[in-house]
């Protein structure tokens, strides 16, 4: 904290300009009027202050706006945003997407900080839902943003926003998150034709149920192995050898290299060996011929 001292004669700031670079911290405190600073915040970003000087400027704004800054100031915070704490940001009411973009720009290229996370949280809560424009903006700055949300938070994403999602945005999503996103994607892309639909839905298939995978197998989609390996094991297990062959098309040969990994390993254990042999890939571990398969889960349901 800078102690209160009178501003030296002739040093009172008439405007926010580069001469302030040469002010000591106590001079900034004494000679810069907080109201002037608030109205000329946009100029602060064009002046290479030190972080210590920014601390003083922040302190002045805090005194002027103890209940939280107005959006007109927030939008022009620029590098001063880096000095804000999550507690400061919780006092804000940010409604403009332009304000959000301006502040995300300051943090660009860095990991998502607690300040940014708080800012996004305040913004999204203020909007009530994660609309397409917001999602577009957030994933542009933070490709992993979507996967940082809980399944509960993802449930507020409207299907229309799914159009903004790129494959790389889903790279770090776990199955529980894809379970929530997949039905939304299915709804969003429902009016597209076969091949176009598959291109769009492919990244979300880690949340697809068995019946949807069966339907896709009838459409000559040629799913690649990377996508297949991300499918839910419980969704893959009921697929027949013929269905998997149709689903993968020419990529079916890749099953051999993945036979020890889930879900391929578990799927192989559920297939008849003679069915697996029809693929001609040398897959081993299927149910030997002549064995009877009892579905115990069905038996439990009946009892």
């Amino acid at each position: 904290e800078v102690e209160k001292t009178a501003c030296p004669s002739g040093k009172k700031a008439r405007e926010i300009d580069e001469s302030l670079i040469f002010y000591k911290k106590w001079e900034l405190e004494a000679c810069v009027d907080a109201a002037l600073l608030a109205t000329q915040m946009d100029r602060v970003n064009a002046i290479p202050f030190t972080y210590e000087q920014l601390d003083v400027l922040k302190h002045k704004l805090d005194e002027l706006y103890p209940q939280g800054y107005p959006e007109s100031v927030i939008q022009h915070l620029g590098y001063l945003f880096l000095k804000m704490s999550p507690e400061d940001i919780r006092k804000w009411n940010v409604t403009s997407l332009e304000t959000l973009k301006a502040l995300l720009e300051v943090n660009k290229g860095h990991e998502m900080s607690p300040q940014v996370a708080t800012l996004i949280d305040r913004f999204v809560k203020g909007r009530g839902q994660l609309d397409k424009d917001t999602l577009d903006t957030l994933t542009a700055f933070y490709p992993g943003y979507l996967c940082s949300l809980s399944p509960e938070e993802l449930s507020s994403v409207p299907p229309s926003s799914i159009w903004a999602v790129r494959p790389q945005d889903l790279d770090t999503c776990d199955p529980r998150q894809l379970d929530v996103l997949y039905p939304k994607a299915r709804l969003a892309f429902q009016n597209m034709n076969g091949s176009e639909y598959f291109v769009k839905i492919q990244s979300f298939l880690g949340g697809a149920p068995t019946e949807d995978l069966k339907a896709l197998s009838q459409q000559n989609v040629s799913m690649d192995l990377a996508t297949f390996m991300k499918l839910r094991t419980d969704a893959v297990l009921p697929l027949t050898v013929a269905e998997v062959q149709k689903l993968l098309g020419p990529h079916v040969e890749g099953l051999k290299a993945e036979e020890r990994h889930r879900p391929v390993r578990d799927w192989i254990l559920r297939q008849r060996q003679d069915d697996l042999d029809t693929l001609g890939l040398g897959l081993q571990g299927g149910i030997p011929n002549g064995y009877l398969v009892l579905d115990l889960s069905m038996q439990e349901a009946l009892s």
Epitope: E18, N45, A46, P48, F49, T50, Y51, L54, Y79, L82
Partner: nanobody, 115 residues
């Protein structure tokens, strides 16, 4: 990213020194550069500033007319020519580079004693 200052030393009042601030690991062309000084027991203060293009320079009132800041982008170096030195100019002089519009990168400093 490193900034290294040199050129400091002991000088008599009225004498001159030329400080250099050399960058390694990045190109100075795109950075605004400031020279700062800190006298023993005192707060650090800004002395001089030059924009990334070199088109804009600025000085603290206490050094105006005596100090000149310049840059040689080909040598990746910024200079501070200090003339008519006074005892109150004594201190550790550091250069800093503004990556965005904050002085982000700092050198270790070079000592100047006017006595």
């Amino acid at each position: 990213l490193q900034l290294v200052e040199s050129g400091g030393g002991l000088v008599q009042p009225g004498g001159s020194l030329r400080l250099s601030c050399a960058a390694s690991g990045f190109t100075l062309d795109y950075y605004a550069i400031g020279w700062f000084r800190q006298a023993p027991g005192k707060e650090r203060e800004g002395v001089s500033y030059i924009s990334s293009s070199g088109g804009s320079t600025n000085y603290a009132d206490s050094v105006k007319g005596r100090f000149t800041i310049s840059r040689d982008n080909a040598k990746n170096t910024v200079y501070l020519q200090m003339n008519s030195l006074k005892p109150e100019d004594t201190g550790v002089y550091s250069c800093a580079a503004a990556g965005g519009y904050v002085m982000d990168y700092w050198g270790q400093g070079t000592s100047v004693t006017v006595s």
